[in-house]
């Protein structure tokens, strides 16, 4: 903690300017109002103060805001925002957006630091729901943030929100969160004709159930195979052979190269062979041909 | 084997309603899409609706969007076609038939409905 | 809607004999083709479906050809259970549309 001096005569700062950067810390403490500070926060970005005079200028302002920064001075923060700690942030009360940008501003191009995600938390559970213009920006700074949440915290996003999502947004989400999103998504392009329906609703298809695949297949959409790969298996498994054959239309043929790897693998040992003969790409491992097929689960169902 | 059975036609009068069914058996029903086509006398086949295997999709022809329900009920194994505002032009052997993609593969042996005054 | 146009619209044949039906789609359809046979008071049955594939049980006289718009069912060699009212039907857009029907016939 810095001691407590008397500023030397003549030189009480009026305004937060250049000439601060060439106090020593002990002159900005015993020189700087807080209440200055905190009017003329704006200016301190422009000043190149060292990280040791920005200490100086935390330390202040916290003894001046015990409870927290009001949002006119959070606002203006802007390298000294990454002064701050996680417990510093839970003390505030961040509603603008704009504020919310200004400081992600700050820590742009680097990984989201502890700093950032407990703003972030902050702002949407002060928000209440993570809207539109919320997810635009954060996923704008953090392409992966979206999949960062907890399927929990994806619960919250209103399906409206859904339209500012980009592929690259849902890369690196599991299928517990797209299991999440995808209803949503659902929601949010039910009313786009088929193409665009699709072409919207590719990138959340890792969570739709058996029966929109089914549906989809009605459309015309031709599903790439990178596409397919991603599909819950378990949604893949009770598509026909005919199914599958539609939703791919001409990238069909592309089975042949995943019939090892998954989803495609499983299907393939869930369908009759001569239905699996009737694509003539030589798949293999299906149902023996005069093979009876028991459903294992209307068997369940009955005992 | 796969089974389909209609039952529900008859004579109504035009803008009256009738309800079809189907009893499916043989198969998982609640695996398949299923549609009702249907043939005027002396005439050809026209597709009329499906529903998807949970019943959450719907799809009809405009000939008859906005008068036909096509429902089910996988618990009871079994396809539903309500027919309301029906017209002279509705007469036809109702066929219920199990989709598979983009295939008619099994058809039920069909139940007569005449709409007459 | 894609309108599906058969020829002839019935034919007269004797047993033994080759029959070629056509079906004529107004756009392209890819190979979404299916071909049905019905006769008299019964139910239609699915013959060949992806324009060449024979459905389960079907005889090897049947076979079908064709892409696009221009479609072919053939009967290599017509027996006495084929004399029937053979329909295709288009599967790759929605409304999925029937062909008006060809009655083949005994000669």
């Known amino acids: 903690e810095v001691e407590k001096t008397a500023c030397p005569s003549g030189k009480k700062a009026r305004e937060i300017d250049e000439s601060l950067i060439f106090y020593k810390k002990w002159e900005l403490e015993a020189c700087v109002d807080a209440a200055l500070l905190a009017t003329q926060m704006d200016r301190v970005n422009a000043i190149p103060f060292t990280y040791e005079q920005l200490d100086v200028l935390k330390h202040k302002l916290d003894e001046l805001y015990p409870q927290g920064y009001p949002e006119s001075v959070i606002q203006h923060l802007g390298y000294l925002f990454l002064k701050m700690s996680p417990e510093d942030i839970r003390k505030w009360n961040v509603t603008s957006l704009e504020t919310l940008k200004a400081l992600l501003e700050v820590n742009k191009g680097h990984e989201m630091s502890p700093q950032v995600a407990t703003l972030i938390d902050r702002f949407v559970k002060g928000r209440g729901q993570l809207d539109k213009d919320t997810l635009d920006t954060l996923t704008a700074f953090y392409p992966g943030y979206l999949c960062s949440l907890s399927p929990e915290e994806l619960s919250s996003v209103p399906p409206s929100s859904i339209w500012a999502v980009r592929p690259q947004d849902l890369d690196t989400c599991d299928p517990r969160q797209l299991d999440v999103l995808y209803p949503k998504a659902r929601l949010a392009f039910q009313n786009m004709n088929g193409s665009e329906y699709f072409v919207k609703i590719q990138s959340f298809l890792g969570g739709a159930p058996t029966e929109d695949l089914k549906a989809l297949s009605q459309q015309n959409v031709s599903m790439d195979l990178a596409t397919f790969m991603k599909l819950r298996t378990d949604a893949v498994l009770p598509l026909t052979v005919a199914e599958v054959q539609k939703l791919l239309g001409p990238h069909v043929e592309g089975l042949k190269a995943e019939e090892r790897h998954r989803p495609v693998r499983d299907w393939i040992l869930r369908q009759r062979q001569d239905d699996l003969d009737t694509l003539g790409l030589g798949l293999q491992g299906g149902i023996p041909n005069g093979y009876l097929v028991l459903d294992l689960s209307m068997q369940e169902a009955l005992s | 084997e796969v089974q389909l059975v209609e039952s529900g036609g008859g004579l109504v009068q035009p803008g009256g309603s009738l309800r079809l069914s189907c009893a499916a058996s043989g198969f998982t029903f609640s695996d398949y899409f299923m549609s009702w086509v249907r043939q005027a006398p002396g005439k050809g086949l026209e597709w009329v609706a499906t529903i998807s295997n949970g019943g959450t999709y719907t799809y009809y022809p405009d000939s008859v969007k906005g008068r036909f329900t096509i429902s089910r009920d996988n618990s009871k194994n079994t396809l539903y076609l309500q027919m309301n505002s029906l017209r002279a032009e509705d007469t036809a052997v109702y066929y219920c038939?199990?989709?598979?993609?983009?295939?008619?593969?099994?058809w039920g042996q069909g139940t007569l409905v005449t709409v007459s005054s | 809607d894609i309108q599906m146009t058969q020829s002839p619209s019935s034919l007269s044949a004797s047993v033994g004999d080759r029959v070629t039906i056509t079906c004529r789609a107004s756009?392209?359809?890819?190979?979404?083709l299916n071909w049905y046979q019905q006769k008299p008071g019964k139910a239609p049955k699915l013959l060949i479906y992806?324009?060449?594939r024979l459905h389960s049980g079907v005889p090897s006289r049947f076979s079908g050809s064709g892409s696009g718009t221009d479609f072919t069912l053939t009967i290599s060699s017509l027996q006495p259970e084929d004399f029937a009212t053979y329909y295709c039907q288009q599967g790759n857009t929605l409304p999925y549309t029937f062909g008006q029907g060809t009655k083949v016939e005994i000669k």
């Open positions: 756009q392209d359809i890819s190979n979404y």
């Open positions: 038939a199990r989709f598979d993609g983009y295939i008619f593969d099994y």
């Open positions: 992806y324009t060449s």
